[in-house]
């Protein structure tokens, strides 16, 4: 039951995370005009991965796509690539994890196969989350660098007089959405990997030994009771995921509310 809950929760968290990564990738507010300590303008600029926008105080908003590939900064291209890879991996992970969910029965799929799929989707979610976090962080670093460069340029020129006001950009909402979404996807992936450990049928330390007594035949399987409970009959004891030696009374560990990645 706990494994099912962990798997289900991991799936839901990852789903929310990937939806967030998609939203962040599509958002226009990756960088927004810095309003602090700047002359108050009647025009507000903001930029995304795919287009830049200008919102006038009149309410009129105009967005222009970046219709060039070669003319764009390499860093922006890298961020785009990371976000797309994150989305693709996350989408595949979601697809795989749907079939891996314990609460969904597909033909006579064995627990071992489900455990495999759960682990695969978990790894995919982890990589997806890392891609998103990396993409957003690279963009944020780019912003910080440009911000201080434009601040330095602001006070240079003829006799220190500011001739033109340089638009400085700061963190937009999409960055925070991306960081949170990447984190959620990562956490969801970790939960799926944890759930996989519970799904994986355990290989017993002793081979099944048959004792032939007179009159009737009884088969004893040391430790077999634990191995067969919860998931129905377990005929094939394949080793799916070896998380190290565990004692009989070991409790499966789950991330607490204090576990942040």
């Amino acid at each position: 039951m706990a494994v099912t809950a962990c798997q289900g929760l991991g799936f839901v968290v990852s789903l929310i995370g990937i939806a967030g990564i998609i939203a962040a990738t599509c958002m226009d507010q990756w960088s927004t005009q810095d309003l602090y300590n700047n002359p108050v303008t009647a025009v507000f600029n903001y930029q995304g991965l795919w287009r830049s926008c200008v919102r006038e105080s009149s309410g009129f908003t105009e967005c222009r796509g970046y219709f060039t590939l070669l003319g764009l900064p390499a860093m922006l291209q890298a961020v785009r690539a990371l976000m797309i890879v994150g989305i693709v991996l996350g989408a595949i992970g979601l697809l795989v994890s749907i079939f891996a969910l314990k609460c969904i029965r597909i033909g006579s799929m064995e627990d071992s196969a489900k455990a495999n799929m759960t682990l695969t989707s978990g790894i995919m979610f982890i990589v997806s989350g890392l891609c998103a976090i990396a993409g957003v962080s690279v963009f944020a670093n780019m912003l910080v660098t440009n911000f201080w460069m434009s601040t330095a340029n602001m006070y240079t020129g003829m006799g220190g007089m500011v001739q033109t006001v340089q638009t400085r950009y700061t963190f937009g909402a999409a960055l925070f959405v991306g960081w949170v979404a990447g984190g959620l996807t990562l956490i969801g992936g970790v939960m799926m990997c944890i759930a996989c450990r519970g799904l994986a049928p355990e290989e017993t330390n002793y081979k099944a030994v048959s004792y032939h007594a007179s009159g009737h035949s009884v088969a004893y399987k040391p430790g077999g009771f634990k191995a067969s409970t919860g998931f129905g009959s377990n005929t094939k004891n394949k080793k799916i995921y070896d998380g190290g030696a565990r004692t009989e009374d070991e409790v499966q560990s789950y991330p607490s509310k204090h576990d942040y990645v």
């Epitope: 005009q33 002359p39 303008t41 009647a42 025009v43 903001y46 009149s58 309410g59 340089q166 638009t167």
Partner: antibody
Framework: EVQLQQSGREVVRPGTSVKVSCKPS????????IDWVKQRPGQGLEWIGG????????VYNERFKDKATLTADKSSSSANMQLSSLTSDDSAVYFC???????????WGQGTLVTVSA | DIVMTQSPSSLTVTAGQKVTMSCKSS????????????LTWYQQKPGQPPKLLIY???TRESGVPDRFTGSGSGKDFTLTISSVQAEDLAVFYC?????????FGAGTKLELK
């Protein structure tokens, strides 16, 4: 056709207040900002401030912050400007205008002449 | 505040003549985000409210005759009337639409000889 109808001329005493109204028609009132502009006889134009009728958000020229108060009444679809502590310097024609793309003013009221006289 | 300086303060012209008037801003009105200059030109005839002629420094408002042309970028702007008509006689104002407070130039008065 977009029109902005302003209230009639006002003759007021120094130290008192006056309210000038502007009633737009021909478009959705809450969709455009309304700006107010002052023009003293034979002089140039001075921007007082603007109001977003939808949200009630205002932006003022610092010079008029203590002089003018801009409001918008959605129920009557009218924008108002209250001028307080009037002096002879406040004698002018006051225009309301609709702010559009480019932050320009495409439609103007006919103007309200406010005369401050003892 | 942004100071808008218009020159000349008045112009005496004859019908059919080409006219240019200047407007200079104390700060650049060019927005890097869309490469548009936030400068507007208005025409005001006696006893009337101003009329919008040109916005974004060079975009003509619908219904405005094509003899009116706006040009310039950054801090220096020009309004050109290719062939002045009698009905064009008025005061022309430029306006900063980029920085608050939105400021107007003192105007250029166009008079007939």
């Amino acid at each position: 056709e977009v029109q902005l109808q302003q209230s009639g001329r006002e003759v007021v005493r120094p130290g008192t207040s006056v309210k000038v109204s502007c009633k737009p028609s021909g478009y959705a009132f809450t969709n455009y900002l309304i700006d107010w502009v002052k023009q003293r006889p034979g002089q140039g134009l001075e921007w007082i401030g603007g109001i977003n009728p939808g949200s009630g958000d205002t932006v003022y020229n610092e010079r008029f912050k203590d002089k003018a108060t801009l409001t918008a009444d959605k129920s009557s679809s009218s924008a108002n400007m209250q001028l307080s502590s009037l002096t002879s310097d406040d004698s002018a024609v006051y225009f309301c205008a609709r702010r559009v793309r480019g932050n320009s003013f495409d439609s103007w009221g006919q103007g309200t002449l406010v005369t401050v006289s003892a | 505040d942004i100071v808008m300086t218009q020159s000349p303060s008045s112009l005496t012209v004859t019908a059919g003549q080409k006219v240019t008037m200047s407007c200079k801003s104390s700060q650049s009105l060019l927005n890097s985000g869309n490469q548009k200059n936030y400068l507007t030109w208005y025409q005001q005839k006696p006893g009337q409210p101003p009329k919008l002629l040109i916005y974004w420094a060079s975009t003509r408002e619908s219904g405005v005759p094509d003899r009116f042309t706006g040009s310039g970028s950054g801090k220096d702007f020009t309004l050109t009337i290719s062939s002045v008509q009698a009905e064009d006689l008025a005061v022309f104002y430029c306006q900063n639409n980029y920085f608050y407070p939105l400021t107007f130039g003192a105007g250029t008065k166009l008079e007939l000889k």
